[in-house]
């Protein structure tokens, strides 16, 4: 017997889809070797309509689509627009048509419902609101109005003009009359229930010169919407409920066992623990919809999702949903970088960022994830030179190492840079990947001096010591600016006294500022880097000022000024101007995006999620 | 939560057919497939049939031992989902189990089912 598994029979009407599963055992050999899904002829043979190689037949042109899942073991046929031409008996398989590796999968496709026996039919997706139209004639238009549903052999009433309302409707049910000029009445039904689908008959008049008008009602459960997405990659689920449920709370939930379905985000300001730090929702439109972005997804993040609207911002029978299929690809095209940084107050921290290779020229950003309400990333820092002001000296966005990876560095860290960070470029959206800085006890591993006064046409010598550990790394200086960090030449001094236990290969490497000029004020950073891979920092402010005393400025450690968690900027330091993003696709189509820089900079906590790929501030 | 309750077993001879039935009641509007199990004397509960939904589109699927014999198919009005079995034989003997399930990403692994009935006997005797 084939190990192939699939469904036998599968039944649809007339222009609706279906999306066909097929199971294998999920070896090297079946994840790679090719899928396809053929029809069989009355002789025997299989033509191939799709296969996973890329062929698709004309007859399924535009409207079909094979996608493999290897690490479930499993591939799917999405055939949309279905006609009763597509009834017949079909074969999904693994390697060549003629060979045993396949299930026989019988596709029946019905007409689709008609208006049969002047029966109106009304097609309704579950939550969403139906309106049964009912014409009558002048001589009952004085009369009683009525709704009935047939249940079993029986019409039960569901409301009439009387103010009668069943129990079962309650609170998502009226009946309006049009004005005198029109001879019809309509019923309106809210937050349809799957249980509300079926026979309904209206009547105008109970006598046998009533007006009756029957009414079919099917209530369509959302046809989950497959999402692929790679591990530590990003997803958005665009949420478009109507405008009927604008004012409603929205909700992002994810199924589990039984009938729960966890409230992932909600509009009500809750967010599952799973999820800090790694996911927004986008302010919604005035017509009701919004998104709501994953990213650093997980191989648990799999699953189906449901976005919905309901005062409790939670799944009740009757809330209007979509729904989604979310799988994760393990085989990702992203690369594994940490999702943990760690860093010491006072010290620096370099990440890395991934992107798509693709899109070298594309613009990178560094954003501040914020849990407030419903989370928001303001950004710090583009490619393109802008830095937010309060974290001018202190941050720089660097396109090395290049080829699918940038670096950020941020040093003078304090307690209140522990929290979740995201990468980003205004090209593939998918592409977002977070990252949490944790600040930890511990001491930096560069040591400077403080804040630094240089005089006007003198020398300014500068010294930065490395500890051992940093014997094999390049060491540098360089001068800070919004589009990152200009080397400078430095004098290698020999080997440092700063550190206790060290040894010879210490190093004091110092920079000098030869007649030093106004324009030589500014922030100087000195730190170590491996090829292209940055390591840590330190920072340093030069102020420039008149001359006082001839000679040259020899600064030591011990004249540094305030600690670096103390440091404050000096409020004459230049502001960037707090420009706007005009990119519409940074946060996928949010159309908000102009006050994602804002200048609000609250204090965070530093929230542990548990991830087990971390690395310390001077590692890469 | 999502009540199931089956009915529909007996006692038969072999050559003979029987019609399960499966009522499900309560928050059955998060389900989006039903199926069948069973468990013959000393042995584990294996997957029969199942069926899944999504709009007016079905999913039948079916364990290798009962194809052509046995048909599931589901009322949608009644929330019922019923098993024709045709041709009983004696090693159909088993306790029937009803199951449903909010997440099916495999209809034949018995962990992908919420929901459980009590169960119906099926005899069939030679």
């Known amino acids: 017997k084939s190990p192939i598994f699939g469904p036998e029979e599968v039944n649809s009407v007339e222009g609706n889809s279906v999306s066909i599963t097929c199971y294998y055992p999920p070896t090297s050999v079946n994840r790679h070797t090719r899928k396809y899904w053929c029809r069989q002829g009355a002789r025997g043979g299989c033509i191939t309509l799709i296969s996973s190689e890329g062929y698709v037949s004309s007859k399924y042109a535009g409207r079909a689509n094979l996608t493999n899942f290897p690490e479930n073991g499993t591939f799917v046929v999405n055939i949309a627009q279905l006609s009763q031409d597509d009834s017949g008996r079909y074969k999904c398989g693994l390697g060549i048509n003629s060979r045993g590796l396949s299930f026989d999968v019988s596709l029946e496709v019905s007409q689709g419902p008609g208006l049969l026996n002047d029966t109106k039919v009304y097609t309704v997706d579950l939550g969403r609101t139906v309106t049964i139209n009912c014409p009558f004639k002048t001589e009952n238009a004085q009369k009683r109005k009525s709704l009935y549903k047939q249940i079993g052999l029986y019409p039960v009433l569901v409301i009439d003009s009387s103010g009668y309302v069943n129990p079962n409707y309650t609170g998502r049910i009226r009946l309006d009359i049009q004005g005198t000029g029109q001879l019809l009445f309509s019923v309106v039904i809210n937050q349809l229930r799957l249980s509300d689908a079926g026979q309904y008959l209206c009547q105008a008049g109970d006598d046998s010169n009533s007006n009756k008008k029957n009414a079919d009602l099917q209530v369509l459960k959302p046809e989950p919407e497959l999402v692929y997405e790679d591990l530590r990659g990003s997803v958005t689920f665009h949420c478009a409920l109507g405008p009927e449920v604008a004012n409603v709370a929205k909700f992002l939930c994810r199924q589990s066992s039984g009938e729960n379905c966890d409230v992932v985000v909600n509009t009500l300001g809750k967010r599952a623990p799973a999820f800090e730090g790694r996911i927004l929702l986008n302010p919604q439109d005035k017509d009701g919809s919004f998104s709501v972005v994953i990213t650093g997804l997980r191989k648990e993040d799999a699953g189906r999702y449901l976005c919905g609207a309901h005062s409790d911002g939670q799944l009740q029978e009757g809330s209007p949903i979509q729904a989604w299929q979310l799988f994760v690809n393990e085989e990702s095209t992203i690369p594994r970088s940490p999702t943990v940084v760690k860093g010491v107050a006072g010290g620096s921290v370099a990440v890395l960022c991934p992107y798509n290779r693709k899109e070298s020229k594309s613009i990178k950003y560094w954003c501040l994830w914020e849990g407030a309400q419903n989370g928001r990333c303001p950004l710090l820092v583009d490619s393109e030179g802008w830095v937010k002001a309060q974290y001018e000296g202190r941050l720089s966005l660097l396109e090395e190492p290049g080829n699918g990876t940038f670096t950020v560095i941020l040093n003078q860290l304090t307690s209140r840079d522990a929290g979740f960070y995201w990468c980003l470029t205004n090209g593939d959206t998918l592409w977002r990947t977070t990252v949490e800085i944790k600040i930890i006890e511990g001491e930096p591993n560069l040591k400077v001096p403080g804040n630094v006064t240089a005089v006007l046409g003198e020398t300014l010598k500068v010294p930065c010591h490395f500890p051992c550990k940093f014997s094999s790394y390049e060491k540098y200086w360089c001068k800070w600016n919004n589009t990152g960090c200009q080397a400078l030449p430095s004098q290698d001094e020999g080997p440092s006294k700063a550190f206790v236990n060290c040894d010879e290969n210490s190093r004091l490497v110092s920079l000098t500022l030869n007649l030093v000029t106004r324009a030589d004020e500014g922030w100087y950073w000195c730190g170590v880097k491996q090829g292209h891979f940055y390591g840590e920092t330190a920072a340093v402010y030069v102020a420039v000022e008149e001359r006082k005393a001839a000679g040259s400025r020899d600064v030591s450690l011990a004249k540094a000024d305030a600690a670096p968690d103390e440091k404050v900027l000096d409020s004459g330091f230049r502001e960037i101007e707090n420009k706007a993003i005009q990119d519409p696709r940074l946060f996928a189509e949010e159309k908000a995006v102009a006050d994602t820089r804002d200048q609000a900079d609250g204090s965070r906590a530093s929230v542990d999620s548990g991830s087990s790929e971390e690395q310390g501030g001077s590692s890469r | 939560q999502v009540q199931l309750v089956e009915s529909g077993g007996g006692l038969v001879q072999a050559g003979d057919s029987l019609r399960l039935s499966c009522a499900a009641s309560g928050r059955t509007f998060t389900t989006y497939g039903m199926g069948w199990f069973r468990q013959g004397p000393g042995k584990e509960r294996e997957f029969v049939a199942t069926?899944?939904?999504?709009?007016?589109?079905?999913?039948?699927y079916y364990t290798d031992s009962v194809k052509g014999r046995f048909t599931i198919s589901r009322d949608n009005a009644k929330n019922t989902v019923y098993l024709q079995m045709n041709s009983l034989k004696p090693e159909d003997t088993a306790v029937y189990y009803c199951?449903?399930?909010?997440?099916?990403?495999?209809?034949?692994?018995?962990?992908?089912?919420?929901?459980w009935g009590q169960g119906t006997q099926v005899t069939v005797s030679s």
């Open positions: 069926i899944t939904w999504s709009g007016s589109t079905n999913y039948k």
């Open positions: 199951a449903a399930s909010t997440v099916l990403t495999d209809p034949r692994r018995l962990n992908e089912y919420d929901y």
